[in-house]
Interface confidence: low
């Protein structure tokens, strides 16, 4: 039977009284419009809530916004609208919260049509006080903080100027005109594209890529014929137009654009796109769209330089540019990613990789579930996960998959069990081992969140009717208790808990509706008294991640090392606490063929660990472009997976020889790049 409140479930004692004493209601003195919520800092308890309400008048729309602040994780709120002079705040810019624990907040105000520039309100004390600043430009984008220094801000203006502030928005300087896109890199570097003839859209494919490392004192052109650019991990990518036609190629740099190499990826045409699905300092997952309006493409994984790519997954579901993909990084276990493929019959199936894209498989069928109508064989089927694509298709899926780095091994997702994703109402499934095995956790769609590093899971049923019940589990979703948090049901709009899953507080947001008005309301529930004591050593057990065969000496080896974690026992009802740190012990593994990707020109046949030569490249010299020189690759088909720490064992030979020939790349070679100073 599905897990629930059966005899095996140990009930949490007196939980109703404990939760009732820790349930805090706040009714907002607002007409219902839109509400946005931001956490300011980590473990500060500070929440800002911005409510906005538009009153459509005959000629124009009149707007009103209110700002509220809590410093106790949402239990109490104070109206601080007067701190921003009762100004209407533009919700499309949201609340720009500073990095780390800087305590900085920027709100962008709505200003009247004829004004010279925009207006912002700035706080650097966790929104206790705000300073009004009038801008010398109208912002087009939200203020962007430098990741290294929260005093440095950049913004684009409606006239495509690039503006920079070095004193947290007090004073602004336009450092460049005709800018399309700007991004902070590392070390306070700014990368941006510029157009020459008229507009960003008109010059797409003829843009220039620029860099400034001194906030606009001097500039360097690092690329021409640019279509777009992106940053991922330590890699800088640019999609560059080819000389002869309308195709584009990806070029990559690992030195901030000083030198570039052409990525060994297929070129794309006008209607196609590239997308960086995930990137870290070791490698990149790149999606390359198929020609035509297919809705799918191919995932490639890079080597440690971002240059040589291996085909990772075919028929990867990704609708048009900026569209939907289900690609999900499972942050609760190293090396695990989930995504969807579009099969030949146009059904959508979920695939999972446990080794950072080396091999993909279907998700194992949950033991407590039956195969649905999509399954040809009622005894053999898989779990299929609903993610962004299902949500975009308006299926009854309120939330994407959820995992948290400090809730080791836990993955929660909506899904269906069959041969493909079903349009039927989904159930909620949980994995406690990073996606290897799954169990049905809740019947029907729910909102869910993880508290206390996995010590508590909270869920609320997704319903069109008003609700007043919350469910919670202290044993990773095996057993559930229900708590009625209010006598009067509310129209539920969202669950909010502090990012990072360390908190024991959950806020339930919604609105009440009466004949005349509707008002925003929040209920914040603190679970601290449910988890009465702090966890001790006896509450934890040793767990070997990625373990599939305990008899095997190499069991648990993924990317060259295995990790043992201390994990909370399901039967322990105790607090991990805000200071909980994941305890893990890694150990290096001997290298096997699993620690190698197939090199350029090679592929891995299904269910085989050996790499074989691609038929179309057999007998050809493998030549590729590196830093503008042509290289000759002598390989027996393998290259070490980026980030793989294995030592010894099998280690196939691979060599790269410089052919001392120039590549035929139309990209700027380093010697042609120019610099200039302001």
């Amino acid at each position: 039977s599905a897990p629930g409140e059966d005899e095996e479930c140990g009930r949490v004692r007196d939980f109703v009284a404990k939760l009732a004493n820790n349930t805090h209601q706040h009714v907002f003195d607002d007409l219902r419009g839109s509400v946005s919520l931001s956490w300011v800092g980590d473990s500060t308890g500070v929440i800002l809530v911005l409510t906005t309400f538009h009153v459509p008048l005959v000629i124009m729309t009149f707007g009103q916004s209110k700002l509220y602040r809590s410093e106790d994780y949402g239990k109490n709120f104070k109206d601080i609208t007067d701190l921003i002079n009762n100004t209407f705040i533009r919700t499309e810019f949201g609340m720009a919260i500073g990095p780390e624990n800087s305590g900085k907040v920027v709100l962008t105000a709505e200003v009247s049509g004829g004004s010279r520039g925009g207006r912002i309100f700035r706080s650097s004390d966790f929104a206790k006080n705000f300073v009004q600043t009038d801008l010398p430009f109208h912002p087009l984008t939200q203020m962007m903080y430098s990741p290294q220094n929260s005093d440095y801000l950049l913004a684009l203006s409606t006239e495509n100027g690039l503006w920079v502030s070095k004193n947290f928005g007090g004073k602004w300087e336009e450092i460049h005109k005709a800018v399309c896109l700007a991004k902070w890199g590392s070390d306070n570097t700014i990368f941006f594209t510029t157009y020459a003839n008229g507009s960003c859209k008109a010059d797409l494919g003829a843009l220039e890529l620029w860099r400034t490392s001194d906030l606009g004192k001097s500039f360097k052109t690092i690329g021409v014929k640019i279509y777009s650019f992106g940053l991922g991990g330590r890699f800088l990518f640019a999609s560059v137009m080819a000389d002869k036609d309308t195709t584009r190629r990806i070029h990559v740099s690992t030195d901030q654009g000083d030198t570039w190499s052409m990525a060994q990826l297929p070129s794309v045409g006008q209607e196609q796109f590239y997308s960086i699905l995930a990137a870290n300092d070791d490698m990149v997952f790149m999606h390359v769209d198929e020609p035509g309006d297919t809705g799918f493409g191919t995932i490639f994984t890079s080597d440690d330089r971002g240059i040589v790519y291996s085909k990772s997954l075919d028929r990867h579901l990704y609708t048009t540019t900026g569209g939907e993909t289900d690609f999900t990084n499972v942050t609760s276990l190293r090396g695990v990613y989930i995504t969807s493929v579009l099969s030949e019959d146009n059904s959508i199936q979920t695939m999972i990789t446990f080794d950072q894209g080396g091999r993909w498989t279907h998700l194992r069928k949950p033991e407590n579930s039956e195969c649905d109508a999509t399954a040809k064989n009622k005894n053999e089927c898989s779990l299929h996960i609903h993610a962004s694509y299902s949500i975009s298709q308006k299926l009854n899926v309120p939330m994407a998959p959820l995992s948290e780095p400090n809730a080791v091994g836990i993955v929660i997702a909506h899904g269906s069990v069959g041969d493909a994703i079903s349009v039927m109402v989904p159930d909620v499934y949980i994995s406690d081992d990073g996606g290897y095995s799954w169990t049905k956790m809740l019947e029907g769609p729910h909102y869910y969140t993880i508290l206390d590093s996995g010590g508590i899971i909270v869920a609320i049923e997704h319903s069109s009717r008003p609700i007043n019940v919350i469910k919670f589990s202290t044993d990773e979703g095996q057993c559930w208790q229900t708590y009625t948090f209010t006598r009067d049901p509310i129209y539920f709009t969202g669950l909010a808990s502090e990012p990072g899953a360390r908190s024991m507080n959950i806020s339930i947001w919604g609105f009440t509706e009466s004949f005349l008005t509707s008002q925003w309301v929040s209920y914040t529930i603190d679970f601290k008294d449910i988890l009465e004591r702090n966890c001790e050593e006896k509450d934890y057990t040793i767990w070997l991640a990625h373990s599939t065969d305990p008899e095997d000496y190499e069991d648990g080896c993924i990317l060259g090392y295995k990790e043992q974690f201390l994990r909370l026992r399901k039967s322990s009802v105790c607090q991990n606490g805000r200071d909980y740190v994941v305890t893990k012990q890694p150990s290096i593994c001997l290298c096997s063929l699993e620690d190698f990707l197939c090199d350029f020109g090679y592929y891995r046949p299904e269910n085989d660990s050996k790499c074989v030569e691609q038929p179309e490249l057999k007998g050809h010299d493998l030549e590729f472009c590196l830093y503008g020189r042509e290289e000759h690759l002598t390989t027996n088909g393998y290259r070490k997976i980026p980030g793989d720490k294995c030592q010894g064992g099998v280690n196939p030979v691979r060599e790269v020889k410089d052919l001392k020939k120039k590549c035929t790349s139309n990209f700027l070679s380093p010697e042609k790049q120019n610099s200039k100073s302001n």
Partner: antibody
């Protein structure tokens, strides 16, 4: 039986160069990382260099980078250490060792290098 | 770089004694540590790898223990052939894979 035999040691002038060799037998040479370790007279062991099985990856301590170069020829089952700009403090017995991962499991008998005028 | 502090630097003991040599590391190396034995004029010999595993052919009177930053090599019931110098070496992460400074075990 695993065997590692170093050669090429001897007397070299300060600023001079020397190339050490290590002949391997009794195991599949091209699937193992290999290392050089040295020991100055009366002193402890000092790691000098490591090379991956295919020869692609090389590692050195910072103080030796640029002066020492480790290389291998898998066809000849041989490991090499090229020493340039010799200094008195390079005087030591140099050992080659098989390096399968978390240890150096087999060592040669060593070859003595003396840097002196 | 990871620093290795081996102690004691020298030690006198008698045949049949139980001897302990410790190696303290400047950061957690997650048991990626090896112990070697070296006799005068000879090459080092691997005794223990991964902190606790005996290498092939090493007598069971040798044992390794420890985790995190503190590791120990123990010799139960010293034999005459055990008098030598012992070194620890870490293999965690990227190089340099430093050795400890050595412990000379002498006959009392």
């Amino acid at each position: 039986e695993v065997q590692l035999v170093e050669s090429g040691g001897g007397l070299v002038q300060p600023g001079g160069s020397l190339r050490l060799s290590c002949a391997a037998s009794g195991f599949t040479f091209n699937i193992y990382g290999m290392s050089w370790v040295r020991q100055a007279p009366g002193k402890g062991l000092e790691w000098v260099a490591t090379i991956s099985s295919g020869g692609i990856y090389t590692y050195y301590p910072d103080i030796l980078k640029g002066r020492f170069t480790i290389s291998r020829d898998n066809a000849k089952n041989s490991l090499y250490l090229q020493m340039n700009s010799g200094r008195a403090e390079d005087t030591a017995v140099y050992y080659c060792a098989r390096h399968p991962g978390g240890a150096m499991d087999y060592w040669g008998q060593g070859t003595l290098v003396t840097v002196s005028s | 770089d990871i620093q290795m502090t081996q102690s004691p630097s020298s030690l006198s003991a008698s045949v049949g004694d139980r001897v302990t040599i410790t190696c303290r590391v400047s950061e957690n190396i997650y048991s990626n540590l090896a112990w070697y034995q070296q006799k005068p004029g000879k090459a080092p010999k691997l005794l223990v790898y991964a902190a606790t595993n005996l290498a092939d052919g090493v007598p069971s009177r040798f044992s390794g223990s420890g985790s995190g930053t503190d590791y120990t090599l123990t010799i139960n019931s010293l034999q005459p052939e055990d008098f030598a110098t012992y070194y620890c070496q870490h293999f965690w992460g990227t190089p340099p894979w430093t050795f400890g400074q050595g412990t000379k075990l002498e006959i009392k």
